[in-house]
């Protein structure tokens, strides 16, 4: 677990958290067939996704130098997602079953960002979008995004993580 | 490649009950839910519920009116599907069902369905 | 609870038609549709989930369409082994419900 200081966290621990939220992303929306919801309208509510850009200290020099600026922003998007999933966006029609993998992704976000946050100290979350599509169509249609969202930047967490582990664990 | 196997077919009187079972291999019984669909004699399909054995938590069909009950063995990893106050309309082919692991409810694998008989 | 509203009820087609069933959800499900086949004396089995993504195995004759409300299974060349009962099936929302059926046979 990261404490106050700036220490690094458990690098493996994330790692194993971070592939296992890569795997789960990636059963939670796999590849649909031609989506006929893709031309009912386009919000704009994946725009304001957290991603991991250049300016985020998550490139292998960055990480070296301080890694608390990448690892908050990573900590940022964790919690960003995790609300988004456990929203009306995910639990109101189309229902998904309790054995749903978006129920385990939820939980491993979570896990994965506590892990991250410092002991006593609150990192700054992101404010998510207020969102209550009333119709099924525009629900589906959010979580695909969502969720294709996700899987991008939990591919690049994945990759953070692997890198911290490989070269800045103690 | 998840496999179901239910019981056999049942002859039943009006008023009474009847427990069919759903035994499941070849996947993680705990990790899916199970469900129930009947087929009346030249009918169509009708879901009555399922069971998801990780927490014992049923869903059902309001529609029958309290008198289905759904249960699972996880030692046996087998589900059991109850109705009671039959009538002759109950007489059906009862399947038990396994859906995607996607999370939503279309159902890939089916049992052979059990024959329920209700009459006098 | 959402109603399927299939049509035809039953149908007759000859080998090599263009055969399409429809269902009609009484609101919005918006693709969360299934199409089963059952042959007589048979358990159903999945053919298209999504109401377009056929399922592993399912041969290409067999398409989906729709979204919302409106919803088609189309057999662009029927073959003789496509005779059976075709139902609709929504998991958008509890209780889940399907079509009445459509029983295909061959002219």
């Known amino acids: 677990r990261a404490v106050p200081g700036g220490s690094s966290p458990a690098w493996t621990q994330c790692q194993q958290l971070s592939q296992k939220l890569c795997t789960l992303a990636w059963s939670a929306h796999p590849l649909v067939g031609h989506m006929d919801l893709r031309e009912e309208g386009d919000e704009e509510t994946t725009n304001d996704v957290p991603h991991i850009q250049c300016g985020d200290g998550c490139d292998p020099q960055g990480l070296r130098d301080n890694s608390q600026f990448c690892l908050q922003r990573i900590h940022q998007g964790l919690i960003f997602y995790e609300k988004l999933l456990g929203s009306d966006i995910f639990t109101g029609e189309p229902s998904l079953l309790p054995d749903s993998p978006v129920g385990q992704l939820h939980a491993s976000l979570l896990g994965l960002s506590q892990l991250l946050q410092p002991e006593g100290h609150h990192w700054e979350t992101q404010q998510i979008p207020s969102l209550s599509p009333s119709q099924p169509w525009q629900r589906l249609l959010l979580r695909f995004k969502i969720l294709r969202s996700l899987q991008a930047f939990v591919a690049v967490a994945a990759r953070v993580f692997a890198h911290g582990a490989a070269t800045l664990s103690p | 490649q998840v496999q179901l196997v239910q019981s056999g077919a049942e002859v039943k009187k009006p008023g009474s009950s009847v427990k069919t079972s759903c035994k499941a291999s070849?996947?993680?019984?705990?990790?899916?839910?199970i469900h129930w669909v009947r087929q009346r004699p030249g009918q169509g399909l009708e879901w009555m519920g399922y069971?998801?054995?990780?927490?014992?938590?049923?869903k059902y069909n309001e529609n029958f009116k309290g008198r289905v009950t759904i249960t699972a063995d996880k030692s046996t990893s087998t589900a059991y599907m109850e109705l009671s106050s039959l009538r002759s309309e109950d007489t059906a082919v009862y399947y038990c069902?396994?859906?995607?692991?996607?999370?939503?409810?279309?159902?890939?694998?089916w049992g052979q369905g059990t024959l329920v008989t209700v009459s006098s | 609870d959402i109603q399927m509203t299939q049509s035809p009820s039953s149908l007759s087609a000859s080998v090599g038609d263009r055969v399409t069933i429809t269902c009609k959800a009484s609101r919005d499900v918006a693709i969360a549709v299934a199409w089963y086949q059952q042959k007589p004396g048979k358990v159903p089995k999945l053919l298209l989930y999504?109401?377009?993504t056929r399922h592993t195995g399912v041969p290409s004759r067999f398409s989906g369409s729709g979204s919302r409300t409106d919803f088609t299974l189309t057999i662009s060349s029927l073959q003789p082994e496509d005779v059976a009962t075709y139902y609709c099936h929504q998991y958008s929302s509890y209780p889940f419900t399907f079509g009445s059926g459509t029983k295909l046979e061959i002219k």
């Open positions: 999504w109401a377009s």
């Open positions: 070849g996947g993680t019984f705990t990790d899916q839910t």
């Open positions: 069902a396994i859906p995607d692991r996607s999370g939503y409810a279309w159902f890939i694998y």
């Open positions: 069971i998801y054995p990780r927490d014992d938590s049923p």
